[in-house]
């Protein structure tokens, strides 16, 4: 008998090279094989459970950046007046959540911020839990 | 044939709103669906393996906080004279280990410390390894 | 019917007590049960996917330390002029990658650096993906 294989884990790596003031960061998924999807500049959560979240990037301007997952809830990450981020967190997310950026710059002279090495990774930590597609 | 499902991963999120000087933090598990249990203010480890550990909280007073897993072993986390914590770590834990807090305050004027957003998450990273219940 | 078990997750914990200037850190795996192997002072990657990486240590001298995984690619971690490290990261690694240290000291008076509590942990986060042995 063939030993059971793991079904694919829900995970995604998105990249971002640009953030817009009072909007967010423009995210793209470089791989077509991701088990999670990007829609309307947000990462769609289909499975309940803990997620390991990694956020990295160097910014061309000083900015304040937050990563949200649900309207009316506090951010997953919140960084004030930074030029870089290299953070890891764990959060419980659920079906219908959407992970997205909010960015504010503190200068009136530019709208877009260049991002070097901008990367957001989400990895589901509770396979076997509830999922809806 | 139905594809194999993942058995539930050992994981738990506990919350704490209060820490006691020279004791620990009073932990409660908000969900009844957790795959790990709290006993005598400690999280019980049933499965050997690496664990992802996330610890967060804002304290009403300056304190020194350690998170232990086994008598005679060094702490998983140790923070000296802090008013907040937001840390992630990886550690190898084993059956019979118990994860618990130790707290010391640096003032004689109070015993209890209020905690805002106090959260401890443990997620097993080696399903398939040895477990005993 | 017996519920399916998880195949072992690819993971390893290596220890290092010594680093050599302009070379790396001498890594040893304390356990024979590891699912990943050390070869030529590097950790061999057999499975594609995200890895959770934990790096800790206290150094006897100030050093600059990088952790690499592939020639011509940037480092997984890069620390400049430090006496300790306690970092966690997430990275996508693939079959044929090798995880290894590069170390530079900023003194001509010694070659070897003693390391206290030197530990590197890798844990695969995408079981079910491609592996080659």
């Amino acid at each position: 008998q063939v030993p059971p294989q793991y079904p694919p884990i829900q995970s995604i790596r998105v990249q971002f090279t640009r953030c817009e003031n009072e909007k967010g960061c423009i995210i793209t998924s470089p791989s077509k094989d991701e088990t999670m999807k990007v829609q309307d500049n947000s990462i769609i959560i289909n499975c309940d459970g803990f997620y390991l979240i990694s956020l990295k990037g160097y910014f061309s301007e000083e900015l304040s950046l937050s990563l949200y997952y649900r309207k009316g809830r506090g951010p997953l990450f919140s960084l004030s007046k930074v030029t870089s981020v290299d953070s890891i967190g764990v959060a419980y997310l659920a079906f219908k959540d959407k992970v997205y950026f909010n960015v504010t710059t503190h200068s009136t002279s530019y709208k877009d911020i260049q991002v070097n090495g901008g990367e957001l990774i989400l990895i589901h930590q509770n396979p076997g839990g509830f999922c809806a597609y | 044939q139905v594809p194999p499902q993942y058995p539930p991963i050992q994981s738990i999120r506990v919350q704490f709103t209060r820490c006691e000087n020279e004791k620990g933090c009073i932990i409660t598990s908000p969900s009844k669906d957790e795959t790990m249990k709290v006993q005598d203010n400690s999280i019980i480890i049933n499965c050997d393996g690496f664990y992802l550990i996330s610890l967060k909280g804002y304290f009403s007073e300056e304190l020194s906080l350690s998170l232990y897993y086994r008598k005679g072993r060094g702490p998983l986390f140790s923070l000296s004279k802090v008013t907040s914590v937001d840390s992630i770590g990886v550690a190898y834990l084993a059956f019979k280990d118990k994860v618990y807090f130790n707290v010391t305050t640096h003032s004689t004027s109070y015993k209890d410390i209020q905690v805002n957003g106090g959260e401890l998450i443990l997620i097993h990273q080696n399903p398939g390894g040895f477990c005993a219940y | 019917q017996v519920p399916p078990q998880y195949p072992p997750i690819q993971s390893i914990r290596v220890q290092f007590t010594r680093c050599e200037n302009e070379k790396g850190c001498i890594i040893t795996s304390p356990s024979k049960d590891e699912t990943m192997k050390v070869q030529d002072n590097s950790i061999i990657i057999n499975c594609d996917g995200f890895y959770l990486i934990s790096l800790k240590g206290y150094f006897s001298e100030e050093l600059s330390l990088s952790l690499y995984y592939r020639k011509g690619r940037g480092p997984l971690f890069s620390l400049s002029k430090v006496t300790s490290v306690d970092s966690i990261g997430v990275a996508y690694l693939a079959f044929k990658d090798k995880v290894y240290f590069n170390v530079t000291t900023h003194s001509t008076s010694y070659k070897d650096i003693q390391v206290n509590g030197g530990e590197l942990i890798l844990i695969h986060q995408n079981p079910g993906g491609f592996c080659a042995y």
Epitope: S60, E61, E62, S109, G117 | - | G74, S80
Partner: antibody
């Protein structure tokens, strides 16, 4: 508005020394790494030196290593390039430019000053 | 160290497409950045990460990168686009590496 203004360029004899300055305004200077890039007359661009935001880490192109020193005074919002043992082939327009930390896996220059001319000739 | 090869000069007819190339060993595995330098002025970043445009750079500028060649395209060249164009990559040992530049003349 971000501004980088170089000064200190001059005519100097081979073997001589010169110190270039770059005054920054319109941003938090202490938060950003900086570099010097040069351009010989009629030639292309060449990176010269880099310094991180705090001033604790520097890098140099092989051709200037041991002769040039990059430094910064964050209190004065000023970047410096001390050039010693100057040679004829150091003749160029020297630009200061804002960049990312060298620990990043990629890098480019996204703000440039207008440059200052250094001429090394006997 | 890593070498980037550019043609010294290129002519383009007004409002026609201009393609400026930058060659390098397996350059497609690196990110390429492009600068425009007009006569007597400082360089200006016009493309980063192969194809991203900074704020204020016209949409007629675009970039691509694969194999051994990166390409800067000006979809309809204007007189004001007459300038020198430099490609640049980041090399962990040599740091910032520039091509020798291409002088674009708009006819």
């Amino acid at each position: 508005e971000v501004q980088l203004v170089e000064s200190g360029g001059d005519l100097v004899k081979p073997g001589g020394s010169l110190r270039l300055s770059c005054v920054a305004s319109g941003f938090t200077f202490s938060s950003f790494p900086m570099s010097w890039v040069r351009q010989a007359p009629g030639k292309g661009l060449q990176w010269v030196a880099y310094i991180n935001s705090g001033g604790s880490s520097t890098s140099y192109a092989d051709v200037v290593k041991g002769r040039f020193t990059i430094s910064r005074d964050n209190a004065k919002n000023t970047l410096y390039l001390q050039m010693n043992s100057l040679r004829a082939d150091d003749t160029a327009v020297y630009y200061c430019a804002r960049t990312f930390p060298t620990v990043a896996t990629d890098n480019w220059f996204y703000y440039w000053g207008q440059g200052t001319l250094v001429t090394v000739s006997s | 160290s890593y070498v980037l090869t550019q043609l010294p000069s290129k002519n383009v007819t007004l409002k026609q497409a201009a393609h400026i190339t930058c060659g390098g060993d397996n350059i497609g595995s690196k990110s390429v950045h492009w600068y425009q330098q007009k006569l007597g002025q400082a360089p200006v970043l016009i493309i980063y990460y192969d194809s991203s445009r900074p704020t204020g750079i016209p949409e007629r500028f675009s970039g691509a990168n694969s194999g051994n060649t990166a390409t800067l395209t000006i979809s309809g060249a204007l007189a004001e686009d007459e300038a020198d164009y430099y490609c640049q990559v980041w090399d962990s040992s040599a740091k910032w590496v520039f091509g020798e530049g291409t002088q674009l003349t708009v006819l």
